[in-house]
């Protein structure tokens, strides 16, 4: 019996589902009652899944496998493996028996992408050519082990003093930390590239070292004094300008935008050309305005993670730089109010009122007050939790003894937007239910 499987390994991302294809050619008159199908681990022979006596015998492998029952009669013996883990990697054998039998093995290759590397520089202040610095590149939770490459701004490999360590967690995912010790040139870019050899995925970051002190006659670079406030998901313009001298041409301009604290490269314009975004492909210059001295940076689809200081570095013959702060904000939702207990309430009862407001940034200030606007500061517990995007949910709980009647208001303030979102509950004198029934 000829059993067919793919020659190439099946590549599956951690956490996703994978299909291990396997097929046979059923003869005319074939019925499932004749079929014995066994999936097993090739090396240990551990049973994974089976079909026998006309019935799916189910998963013997952590309840994460399934056949395609509607397709079996057509010769499709493929196996679905759910929520793939690193531990699943290896060879699976598909064994098919009708009158004759046959088998074939298919390889599962598991992979997980590495995170965008973080770059740190030590020391990171008052750097001068000739100083020795340590640059650390860290990337997280990938599989299999990464290949790490360092290069300078011209793409020349830096193979000198590099130490790379990789650590695996209980799930088998690796963190990689690579440390480069280098003597600074006059100025330069140092890039770290973390490659996933299976996915052929490259995650990279760069730091750019710019001169710290300028001679007299420095280029005057102007940025706004106040932080630029941008709502999550919108675009922001970080304004930066310089005064070009008569006869200035873009061929003379070196413009570098970088993160102020880590020196990570964000965007650059050199040798008369826009060198593009080094920051998640979400940045752009204003090319038509550069010749007039407008070096502003457009940052698209702002995220909480973008918050911080960005330095605009302009070099023509002399150079100058200035930093502009980006303050990210997101409005809080209208609070939802819940009351416990919420039935047959009477004056003198102790109730718990919960005020919940969602997906704001930065952390909120929460105020409780009664119907007369008098603050209620007594028994209040407020907790804030950030999600993966950095947006906060706020839950504030007030425990209060009911008066004859009264209103209890919760105000959630966004300190950056000066936006107030409020909700309230009103308790009447009669026994009542909350929310009031229609």
């Amino acid at each position: 019996l000829e059993v067919q499987v793919p020659e190439d390994p099946v590549v599956a991302l951690v956490g996703t589902d994978a299909t291990l294809c396997c097929s046979f050619s059923p003869e005319p008159g074939f019925s499932l009652a004749q079929l014995n199908l066994i999936w097993q681990l090739t090396d240990t022979k551990q049973l994974v899944h089976s079909f026998a006596e006309g019935q799916d015998q189910g998963s013997a492998y952590a309840n994460r496998t399934a056949l395609f029952p509607d397709l079996l009669a057509q010769g499709n013996a493929s196996l679905r493996l759910q929520r793939v883990r690193v531990a699943d990697e290896g060879s699976f054998t598909c064994f098919v028996s009708i009158r004759d039998f046959g088998s074939a093995a298919v390889s599962l290759q598991v992979a997980a992408p590495y995170s965008k590397p973080s770059m740190t520089l030590e020391p990171n202040k008052d750097l001068r050519p000739g100083d020795t610095v340590t640059i650390t590149c860290s990337s997280y939770q990938g599989y299999p082990e990464a290949e790490v490459f360092w290069q300078d701004g011209q793409g020349v490999p830096l193979t000198g003093n590099v130490t790379t360590s990789q650590m695996a967690n209980e799930q088998g995912l690796f963190d990689v930390h690579s440390i480069l010790r280098v003597v600074l040139g006059a100025n330069g870019t140092y890039s770290c590239l973390v490659r996933n050899p299976v996915l052929q995925q490259d995650a990279h970051s760069s730091v750019t070292i710019t001169p710290q002190r300028s001679p007299t006659g420095a280029v005057e670079v102007q940025v706004p004094e106040d932080p630029v406030v941008a709502l999550v998901g919108t675009d922001a313009t970080l304004r930066c300008s310089f005064s070009p001298e008569p006869g200035f041409s873009l061929a003379q301009l070196n413009l570098i935008w970088q993160l102020t604290d880590t020196k990570q490269l964000v965007h650059s314009f050199t040798e008369g050309r826009d060198q593009g975004s080094a920051y998640a492909n979400r940045t752009a210059l204003f090319p038509d305005l550069l010749a007039q001295g407008n070096a502003s940076l457009r940052l698209q689809r702002v995220r909480v993670a973008d918050e911080g200081s960005f330095t605009c570095f302009v070099s023509i013959r002399d150079f100058g730089s200035a930093a502009v702060s980006l303050q990210v904000a997101a409005p809080y939702s209208k609070p939802s109010m819940t009351l416990e207990p919420n039935k047959d309430l009477r004056p003198g009862d102790t109730v718990t009122i919960t005020c919940s407001s969602y997906r704001g940034y930065p952390e909120a200030e929460v105020f409780w007050q009664d119907g007369q606007g008098v603050p209620l500061t007594g028994n209040v517990t407020t907790s804030q939790m950030a999600n993966e995007q950095g947006l906060f949910d706020v839950h504030s709980v007030l425990r209060v003894v009911l008066g004859a009647n009264g209103t209890y208001s919760c105000l959630v303030r966004n300190p950056v937007l000066q936006q107030d979102a409020h909700g309230s509950v009103t308790i009447t004198g009669q026994p009542m239910t909350f929310p009031p029934e229609a």
Epitope: K116, N169, T262, A305, A386, E388
Partner: nanobody, 117 residues
Framework: EVQLVESGGGEVQPGGSLRLSCAAS????????MSWFRQAPGKQREPVAT???????NYAESVKGRFTISRDNAKNTVYLQMNSLRAEDTAVYYC???????????WGQGTLVTVKP
């Protein structure tokens, strides 16, 4: 900018225990991968343990089963519980914070751990 302040270092005998703390400024602590590195005299800095923002942890082979990293997001603090200390654990221990999404990274100033009889 995130500021990191380590504490809890000191001198201890072989087999003893220490607990290091690293307090971070800033309101998005839960977004950071928090790591402990160490640097022994004359050696390169090396990673010891990491607490990911998603809750999983990684350890260097040399400390597995002896060191435990944990974090308290409410207190913006990461800890390193070090048990069964050995002479070769003597080093300056540094705290590192790496943002899980934007590539920003920060170091603390370090705290010295000395293991000697």
């Amino acid at each position: 900018e995130v500021q990191l302040v380590e504490s809890g270092g000191g001198e201890v005998q072989p087999g003893g225990s220490l607990r290091l703390s690293c307090a971070a400024s800033g309101s998005t602590f839960s977004m950071y991968h928090m790591s402990w590195f160490r640097q022994a005299p004359g050696k390169q800095r090396e990673p010891v343990a990491t607490s990911h923002h998603g809750g999983t942890t990684n350890y260097a082979e040399s400390v597995k089963g002896r060191f435990t990293i944990s974090r308290d997001n409410a207190k913006n603090t990461v800890y390193l519980q070090m048990n069964s200390l050995r002479a070769e654990d003597t080093a300056v221990y540094y705290c590192k914070a790496d943002h899980g999404y934007n590539g920003r990274g920060y170091w603390g100033q370090g705290t010295l751990v000395t293991v000697k009889p």
